[in-house]
């Protein structure tokens, strides 16, 4: 079997939800010694990057200028160390928003609630689009769809304080071209009285993984290293 | 605004050579990434050679040890030169860039490109 290095990671920086006109950052997360980075996108190669030097880096970013619906897909990285080719990273789906229209978002029975009520959100654009979302805020990998020819309708069931949180919805004109995003709708769930001091809130941070971690490998750690390497070699 | 200038096509014969040139209007070209694509009658428009801000270069497997892309940064310009020039290179060529880039990226599709020229017609027949 041909031999193949571990695939990188890819990550969109910051979000990957990219107003039109801006810039989405791609980071591929491969090797230190890497000399080459591929992005490709829907299949198709899209850019290369030879980082300089490439043993002082594990990574690199690509950026993506004047984002529209024609570079909204699919992207995945490889990278190349000597002649020998890495797997292909996951797929990262990068999606641009501020298409057309603003959907309106509305909660049923209101935006104030008890725990074990059923609640309802509904998100309503007069465009002509069928697909519709639903994202909570610090949560924007877990987005719910719905269908609808104007209006859609998101059931959550009977909520928790784990529902508490700030709601937004957009329509979609495909998977990866969205609306403007609706204006958040807060949903303040109560718990039983003597459970809502303890009721966990949403964490007010980013989502974890829209960070790019590359690092620049310094003198320092190539000292560690060596005498990690050195210090092998005795114990051996 | 970008504005992207080609020119130097014209009809060569097979074996020939070519230097096109792409003038760039702007104060953002030391900020761009250029590239060369080019349409053959009833084709689709194909990737030719691009290069980065800083000097690295990437070409189509078709081209590559003939033509050379190069930038002059003080003029505006990227060059493409072309050498042993065949039949199937003949081909209207665009010039394109992607402004504004803020790494080292060779951009090798032709949806990352967000200024085109009007493209220069080249012709190799015998």
């Known amino acids: 079997p041909k031999q193949t290095l571990p695939k990188p990671i890819i990550r969109a920086e910051s979000t990957y939800m990219v107003p039109k006109e801006k810039q989405a950052t791609l980071c591929c997360q491969g090797s230190y010694g890497a000399v080459e980075y591929q992005l490709h996108f829907e299949g198709s190669l899209f850019a290369v990057e030879r980082p300089k030097p490439p043993e002082r880096i594990n990574g690199v970013k690509f950026h993506i200028p004047d984002m529209n619906s024609r570079k909204a897909g699919r992207y995945s990285c490889i990278y190349r160390v000597g002649e020998l080719w890495s797997e292909r990273s996951d797929l990262l789906d990068l999606v641009v928003t501020e298409m057309y229209d603003t959907p309106t978002l509305s909660v049923h029975p209101g935006p104030e609630v008890t725990s074990g009520e059923k609640v309802t959100f509904y998100c309503r654009l007069d465009t002509a689009t069928s697909m519709f979302l639903l994202l909570k805020e610090g949560r924007s990998r877990d987005v719910q769809r719905s269908y609808g020819k104007v209006q859609a309708e998101f059931p959550m069931g009977p909520v928790t304080t784990a529902h508490r949180g700030s709601y937004r919805c957009f329509g979609s004109y495909n998977n990866y071209a969205w609306s403007f995003p609706s204006e958040p709708v807060k949903l303040l769930v109560t718990g039983d009285i003597e459970n809502t001091s303890l009721a966990p809130t949403d964490p007010t941070f980013p989502d974890s993984w829209d960070t790019c971690l590359l690092t620049r490998e310094t003198g320092l750690q190539k000292d560690l290293a060596l005498w990690d390497h050195t210090a092998q070699n005795l114990l051996r | 605004e970008v504005q992207l200038v080609e020119s130097g096509g014209g009809e060569v014969q097979p074996g020939g050579s070519l230097r096109l040139s792409c003038a760039a209007s702007?104060?953002?070209?030391?900020?761009?990434?250029m590239g060369w694509f080019r349409q053959a009658p009833g084709k689709e428009r194909e990737f030719v050679a691009a290069?980065?801000?800083?000097?690295?270069?990437y070409y189509a497997e078709s081209v590559k040890g003939r033509f050379t892309i190069s930038r002059d940064n003080a003029k505006n310009t990227v060059y493409l030169q072309m050498s042993s020039l065949r039949a199937e290179d003949t081909a209207v060529y665009y010039c394109?860039?992607?402004?504004?880039?803020?790494?080292?990226?060779?951009?090798?599709?032709?949806?990352?490109?967000?200024?085109w020229g009007q493209g220069t017609l080249v012709t190799v027949k015998p």
């Open positions: 394109a860039a992607v402004v504004p880039t803020y790494g080292n990226a060779i951009y090798v599709h032709s949806a990352a490109y967000n200024y």
């Open positions: 290069i980065s801000r800083s000097d690295d270069t």
């Open positions: 702007g104060r953002t070209f030391a900020s761009a990434a």
